[in-house]
């Protein structure tokens, strides 16, 4: 069985992640995790200095 691509992305999308489609890539820890463990990043108010939110890259098959 030939292994298909992990992800299908737009031309300007980030490079493919090592995650299977069942998981998301956590940019903060640079690891694949369950997508529910990530939080969608929200825009920060101007001047806010809170730590950067966890973000994810996730393939759409």
């Amino acid at each position: 069985m030939r292994r298909g691509p992990r992800s299908l992305r737009g031309r300007d999308a980030p490079a493919p992640t090592p995650c299977v489609p069942a998981e998301c890539f956590d940019l903060l820890v640079r690891a694949c995790v369950a997508c529910g463990l990530l939080r969608t990043p929200r825009p920060k108010p101007a001047g806010a200095s809170s730590p950067a939110p966890r973000t994810a890259l996730q393939p759409q098959e």
């Epitope: 069942a22 369950a34 997508c35 463990l37 990530l38 969608t40 994810a56 996730q58 759409q60």
Partner: antibody, heavy 118, light 113 residues
Framework: EVKLVESGGGLVQPGGSLRLSCAIS????????MSWVRQPPGKALEWLGF??????????EYNPSVKGRFTISRDNSQSIFYLQMNTLRAEDSATYYC?????????WGQGTTVTVSA | DIVMSQSPSSLAVSVGEKVTMSCKSS????????????LAWYQQKPGQSPKLLIY???TRESGVPDRFTGSGSGTDFTLTISSVKAEDLAVYYC?????????FGGGTKLEIK
Amino acid sequence: EVKLVESGGGLVQPGGSLRLSCAISGFTVTAYYMSWVRQPPGKALEWLGFIRDKANGYTTEYNPSVKGRFTISRDNSQSIFYLQMNTLRAEDSATYYCAQVRRALDYWGQGTTVTVSA
Amino acid sequence: DIVMSQSPSSLAVSVGEKVTMSCKSSQSLLYSSNQNNYLAWYQQKPGQSPKLLIYWASTRESGVPDRFTGSGSGTDFTLTISSVKAEDLAVYYCQQYYTYPYTFGGGTKLEIK
């Protein structure tokens, strides 16, 4: 064709240990996550955990219900994936399945039965 | 842990009838960044291992007949069999893979009248 064949089940006494095997064929072993799921007789399925692929350093995730007693590992040279079960209890009696993880639990083996009884 | 609740626990239908079964999760399975619901449906025929039917709540696995349709989002999901065949006799399980531990529903047993 993807093929998963479990073995190693049987009768074991409470407190004992058992190692289940899942022989893999039909795909590149190092390139897929592999999971274990169990099903007590007449009951629903319970996910036990999985081991990620080579690209992810073969890291593992476990169900807290078995973490510390069960260990998932793999021998890629022989295309075998293992479930080491320690300190077994009566409630661990079940059919144990291995499954390939990709979009969800994509392909399943036929299962091997474990009975924990004195 | 996310609790998955399926209903009904069993149902009996005649060949050719339409069947719907429900799966509810204790929290949303929708990941807003990609609009995917991390829910799968499996079919387990008597004496066999489970088989993946649907992933991402509504995407049919390759080779699965188009009479099987998954729908829903967030916490409420449905599996529909448009015209039941005798070979559809099985237990159907939903499963979330939104977070660890992955959890399954208790199953819906489909019997043929």
